[in-house]
């Protein structure tokens, strides 16, 4: 069964900077990745970035840089301009559209006890929606 993993990392040097890493474990070819925060895409979440392997990427504030890391994983850098850090308690979700498997989504957040610079363990919370 395909699986999506999500890691949220706080940068040690800049506490207002976060990076979300997402990956797809399974067969098939990734055709689109959607990253959202506050919940799954289309279910209360706000879209942060869309990555298409053959057309490019699109991102929206506070996303700063979305990029492919491998053929099946991406990273999204976020910049928190506010004094407080809302990202620390936020859920980030990644949805991978894979042919012919369908869409697979998982969400994750920064653990409350995380030290800066340490990434959250890959604890997938699969939302199995084979669209």
């Amino acid at each position: 069964t395909p699986e999506v993993w999500v890691q949220v990392q706080m940068e040690a040097t800049e506490l207002s900077s976060f990076t979300v890493h997402c990956g797809f474990l399974g067969p098939g070819s990734i055709s689109l990745v959607t990253v959202s925060w506050g919940g799954p895409d289309g279910a209360g979440g706000t879209k942060l970035a869309v990555l298409h392997p053959e057309l490019g990427t699109r991102q929206w504030a506070p996303a700063r840089q979305a990029r492919w890391e491998t053929q099946s994983s991406i990273s999204l850098a976020l910049e928190d301009s506010g004094a407080s850090s809302p990202f620390a308690n936020t859920t980030f979700c990644c949805k991978f559209a894979s042919f012919p498997e369908g869409s697979w989504e998982s969400c994750g957040s920064l653990p409350p006890s995380s030290d800066p610079g340490l990434s959250a363990p890959p604890t997938p919370v699969p939302i199995l929606r084979a669209d």
Partner: nanobody, 118 residues
């Protein structure tokens, strides 16, 4: 499908300058890597310069200090400012885009001719 349209080529004297432009037509997305390659008569196509949308730049040694690559604000256009042109810079210059940065799908423009001659 991404289409790349180049402009700015032409005939210039040695020591002169040209500015090449390349725009991706009707793309909703930002293209991660864009760049310029060139092919001189009877030679293989070679990298001239590339730039990622995060600003990482790479040049072939022979153009360092003479050519400058840059990107438009929309992240789907790229420019090549060519100064102190030499006869050996004569070639067809091709715009290139690698949307993912992984080489999964690479797009090419139709090419624009640059001739450096007195």
């Amino acid at each position: 499908e991404v289409q790349l349209v180049e402009s700015g080529g032409g005939l210039v004297q040695p020591g002169g300058s040209l500015r090449l432009s390349c725009a991706a037509s009707e793309t909703y997305f930002d293209l991660y890597v864009m760049g310029w390659y060139r092919q001189a008569p009877g030679k293989d196509r070679e990298l001239v310069a590339t730039i990622t949308y995060t600003g990482s730049i790479k040049y072939v040694d022979s153009v360092k200090g003479r050519f400058t690559i840059s990107r438009g604000d929309a992240k789907n256009s790229v420019y090549l400012q060519m100064n102190s042109l030499r006869a050996e810079d004569t070639a067809v210059y091709y715009c290139n885009a690698d949307p993912s940065g992984l080489g999964r799908k690479v797009y090419w423009g139709q090419g624009t001719m640059v001739t450096v001659s007195s």
